[in-house]
C-alpha cells in the first residue's frame, strides 16, 4: 500500500481467483484513543472500533472511503483504491490502446516545435467518475523539471455504438533550449482513477521524436502564363522554431481530387514555393516536416485549384 | 560562442553540401545497423545516449544562432562573454566566433572518425562478419574535415591488445551512430544557418 495523495491510498493486488489479498491497517488521524468506530462509504454498519482498523482487501467491495467517527463526529477519512496486477502485468482497463505507432500505446504526445512545450492525449470510453493527474520530468534518476497543466476533456467522438472521450494535457519543460541535443528522455506519468480503480500509464520520448509542425500558412496560387502549371507559395507556420535558417523545414506539395484514389501530382521541396499542375475540381495541399530530423509530417494545408 | 548573422565565408557553401552528405551517410549507416543488428538493443529507445564529445567540445553552444542567445536556457553555465547586449558584433569578433564554431565541429568529426576507425578494426576481426562501417560515411567525414580546413594534432588511433568483445562493440556502434546522427543534425542546421546569413 502507498499514499497517492493526502488520505488516498493505493492497494496493489495480485488479481486471480481466490487470491489472498492484502492486509491493510488503517489508523484514525486523531489524538483521541477510545470510543472510535469505523464505517465504509455511505453505510452505517460499524466495521470495527479502536484507533486502528485491520482489513483484508481482496476485491473492489473492500475498497472505498473508510471513515472513523466518535460520537457522531467524523474524525478522518482514508480512501482505498485498488491497483490490479494480472499475470504480473498491471491492468490497463481505463485507457484505450491507440495502437499507433505500436501496440500498447496509451499516451500519445506531440510537439509543434523545439521550445520544450508538448501536448499528450489519451482515449477512454468511460464518461463518469474519472480523474487524471499528470506528472513529467526530463530523465528519471536525476529528474529535471517539466510543468504540466490539468488534464481536460478535449474531444468526444461516436465510434459505432460507443462514445469515445479524448483527454489532453499541455506540459512545458522548465528550462529548454531549442538547439539542445537531448540525451535524457522526457518521462510522462499519468495517474488514472475510475471509481475505486487506480491505474498508471507512462510514456518516454525525446522532443525531437515527437515533433509535428503545424501546417504551412498563407498558401497562395499564381497561374503561369500559357501553361497548365501554377506556382504555389506558402510560409512557415507561426508556431515553428526560429530562426528558420537553423530550424529548416522541408515540404511536400500535392495536387489531388476529392478521392485519395484519384491521380495526383506530387513534388518535394525545401523552398517555400513550387510549380505544379492544377486540375479542375482538385486542390493543392502542402505539408511540412523538419528538414534534418525526420519526425512526423504536419497536417495538410489546402486551397482549391480553381 | 554564438553565431551572429554575418556574411559567411565564400567557402561556406561546400561545407553545407558536405554536411548534408554527412547527415545522409550517418542516417543510412544507422538504418543499416538497426536492420543488421535487429536482435541487439540498437533502437533509440533501447540504447544509452552517450556523447563522446561531452566536456571536450561545445558545438551546440559555440554554434548557437544569435536569435537564441537571448534564451537563458541556451546560455546556462556557458561562456557568454561574447554577447554584448544582443547588439551586432564587430566583424572581427564575428569571424572569431564563427571560427570557434567551425573548429568545434572539426574536433567533433575528428573524435568520431577515430572512434569509428577503431571500431571498424574490431568489427573486421569478427568471425561473423556481421557489420562493418560504411566506407562512404568515413569518406564523407574526411571530406567535411578537409572542407573545414583546420589543422590540429592528429589523434592516435586507439589500439587494444585484449580480445574484442564483439557483442559490446556492436552495441557501442549503435550508441555511437545515434549520437553522431544527432550531432550531424546540429552540424547541418549550423551550416544551413551560416549559408543563409
Amino acid at each position: 500500500i502507498w499514499e497517492l495523495k493526502k488520505d488516498v491510498y493505493v492497494v496493489e493486488l495480485d488479481w486471480y481467483p481466490d487470491a489472498p489479498g492484502e492486509m491493510v491497517v488503517l489508523t484514525c488521524d486523531t489524538p483521541e484513543e477510545d470510543g472510535i468506530t469505523w464505517t465504509l462509504d455511505q453505510s452505517s454498519e460499524v466495521l470495527g472500533s479502536g484507533k486502528t482498523l485491520t482489513i483484508q482487501v481482496k476485491e473492489f467491495g473492500d475498497a472505498g472511503q473508510y471513515t472513523c467517527h466518535k460520537g457522531g463526529e467524523v474524525l478522518s477519512h482514508s480512501l482505498l483504491l485498488l491497483h490490479k496486477k494480472e499475470d504480473g502485468i498491471w491492468s490497463t482497463d481505463i485507457l484505450k490502446d491507440q495502437k499507433e505507432p505500436k501496440n500498447k500505446t496509451f499516451l500519445r504526445c506531440e510537439a509543434k516545435n523545439y521550445s520544450g512545450r508538448f501536448t499528450c492525449w489519451w482515449l477512454t470510453t468511460i464518461s463518469t467518475d474519472l480523474t487524471f493527474s499528470v506528472k513529467s520530468s526530463r530523465g528519471s534518476s536525476d529528474p529535471q523539471g517539466v510543468t504540466c497543466g490539468a488534464a481536460t476533456l478535449s474531444a468526444e467522438r461516436v465510434r459505432g455504438d460507443n462514445k469515445e472521450y479524448e483527454y489532453s494535457v499541455e506540459c512545458q519543460e522548465d528550462s529548454a533550449c531549442p538547439a539542445a541535443e537531448e540525451s535524457l528522455p522526457i518521462e510522462v506519468m499519468v495517474d488514472a482513477v475510475h471509481k475505486l480503480k487506480y491505474e498508471n500509464y507512462t510514456s518516454s520520448f525525446f522532443i525531437r521524436d515527437i515533433i509535428k509542425p503545424d501546417p504551412p500558412k498563407n498558401l497562395q496560387l499564381k497561374p503561369l502564363k500559357n501553361s497548365r502549371q501554377v506556382e504555389v507559395s506558402w510560409e512557415y507556420p507561426d508556431t515553428w522554431s526560429t530562426p528558420h535558417s537553423y530550424f529548416s523545414l522541408t515540404f511536400c506539395v500535392q495536387v489531388q481530387g476529392k478521392s485519395k484514389r484519384e491521380k495526383k501530382d506530387r513534388v518535394f521541396t525545401d523552398k517555400t514555393s513550387a510549380t505544379v499542375i492544377c486540375r479542375k475540381n482538385a486542390s493543392i495541399s502542402v505539408r511540412a516536416q523538419d528538414r534534418y530530423y525526420s519526425s512526423s509530417w504536419s497536417e495538410w494545408a489546402s486551397v482549391p485549384c480553381s | 560562442r554564438n553565431l551572429p548573422v554575418a556574411t559567411p565565408d565564400p567557402g561556406m557553401f561546400p561545407c553545407l553540401h558536405h554536411s548534408q552528405n554527412l547527415l545522409r551517410a550517418v542516417s543510412n549507416m544507422l538504418q543499416k545497423a538497426r536492420q543488421t543488428l535487429e536482435f541487439y538493443p540498437c533502437t533509440s529507445e533501447e540504447i544509452d545516449h552517450e556523447d563522446i564529445t561531452k566536456d571536450k567540445t561545445s558545438t551546440v553552444e559555440a554554434c548557437l544562432p544569435l536569435e537564441l542567445t537571448k534564451n537563458e536556457s541556451c546560455l546556462n553555465s556557458r561562456e557568454t562573454s561574447f554577447i554584448t547586449n544582443g547588439s551586432c558584433l564587430a566583424s572581427r569578433k564575428t569571424s572569431f566566433m564563427m571560427a570557434l564554431c567551425l573548429s568545434s565541429i572539426y574536433e567533433d568529426l575528428k573524435m568520431y572518425q577515430v572512434e569509428f576507425k577503431t571500431m571498424n578494426a574490431k568489427l573486421l576481426m569478427d568471425p561473423k562478419r556481421q557489420i562493418f562501417l560504411d566506407q562512404n560515411m568515413l569518406a564523407v567525414i574526411d571530406e567535411l574535415m578537409q572542407a573545414l580546413n583546420f589543422n590540429s594534432e592528429t589523434v592516435p588511433q586507439k589500439s587494444s591488445l585484449e580480445e574484442p568483445d564483439f557483442y559490446k562493440t556492436k552495441i557501442k556502434l549503435c550508441i555511437l551512430l545515434h549520437a553522431f546522427r544527432i550531432r550531424a543534425v546540429t552540424i547541418d542546421r549550423v551550416m544551413s544557418y551560416l549559408n543563409a546569413s
Epitope: 502549371q229 484514389r261 484519384e262 491521380k263 501530382d265 513534388v267 510549380t275 499542375i277 486540375r279 | -
Partner: antibody, heavy 118, light 107 residues
C-alpha cells in the same frame, strides 16, 4: 493487371509523320496520366510529354513543342502520339508509360520501333 | 532544364557483391528522383521512387538514398538477373529528364 500494348514497328521517310498507339487495359483509362518516352538506338531515355486522358490536357517537353501531338480516345482506352516532320535522328523506340502520379512512370508499354530512313 | 549525370557509365561487379550507382543533379531537386532498370530489348521498370521509397515486388536488395543533388542506388548483393542498365529520373520540374544510365555488367 495494368497493361499497355503498343502498335507495331514503323518505317517512315524523312519529312513524313508517324502515329503510334498505346492501348490500356486493367484499369480505368482516365485514372492514370499517360506519358511518351523515347530511346534512340544505344542511347538513354528522353521524355517527350504527358496527356491527361480525363480532359485532354497535355504538356510537352520544349524540344518536341510544335512537332508532337498527344491524343486519347477514352471509348477505346487508347492513347496516340503523332510525330511530324520526321528526321533520321527521330529513329528510336517510342514507349508509352502510365502512372496515377504525374511525374514518374509505373507501367510501361513494350515499345514501338520507329525507323526514319530515306 | 535539369541535367542528370550518372556515374560510372559502366560498373563491373561480381555476382554476390555490392553495387553502388551514383546520380547527380545540376541543381537541388530535394528527393524528386526515381530509379529504373532496363534489360536489353525490354521496357524500363520502376525500382525506387522519391529517392528511397521501395516498390512492392521489387527485391529488398535494391535501395535508394540521397537528396538535394546527390543520389545513390545500392544493390546489396548482385544477382545474375540484376545485370542491366539503370537510369535515374528527376521530377522536380518539367521537362522531366533522365540520366545517361549506368550499365552494370558481370566482372
Amino acid at each position: 493487371q495494368v497493361q499497355l500494348v503498343q502498335s507495331g514497328a514503323e518505317v517512315e521517310k524523312p519529312g513524313a509523320s508517324v502515329k503510334v498507339s498505346c492501348k490500356a487495359s486493367g484499369y480505368t483509362f482516365t485514372d492514370y496520366y499517360l506519358h511518351w518516352v523515347r530511346q534512340a538506338p544505344g542511347q538513354g531515355l528522353e521524355w517527350m510529354g504527358w496527356i491527361d486522358p480525363e480532359n485532354g490536357d497535355t504538356e510537352y517537353a520544349p524540344k518536341f513543342q510544335g512537332g508532337v501531338t498527344m491524343t486519347t480516345d477514352t471509348s477505346t482506352s487508347t492513347a496516340y502520339m503523332e510525330l511530324r516532320s520526321l528526321r533520321s535522328d527521330d529513329t528510336a523506340v517510342y514507349y508509352c508509360a502510365a502512372n496515377k502520379e504525374l511525374r514518374y512512370f509505373d507501367v510501361w508499354g513494350q515499345g514501338t520501333m520507329v525507323t526514319v530512313s530515306s | 532544364e535539369i541535367v542528370m549525370t550518372q556515374s560510372p557509365a559502366t560498373l563491373s561487379v561480381s555476382p554476390g557483391e555490392r553495387a553502388t550507382l551514383s546520380c547527380r543533379a545540376s541543381q537541388s531537386i530535394s528527393i524528386n528522383l526515381h530509379w529504373y532498370q532496363q534489360k536489353p530489348g525490354q521496357a524500363p521498370r520502376l525500382l525506387i521512387y522519391f529517392a528511397s521509397q521501395s516498390i512492392s515486388g521489387i527485391p529488398a536488395r535494391f535501395s535508394g538514398s540521397g537528396s538535394g543533388t546527390e543520389f545513390t542506388l545500392t544493390i546489396s548483393s548482385l544477382q545474375s538477373e540484376d545485370f542491366a542498365v539503370y537510369y535515374c529520373q528527376q521530377s522536380n520540374s518539367f521537362p522531366l529528364t533522365f540520366g545517361g544510365g549506368t550499365k552494370v555488367e558481370i566482372k
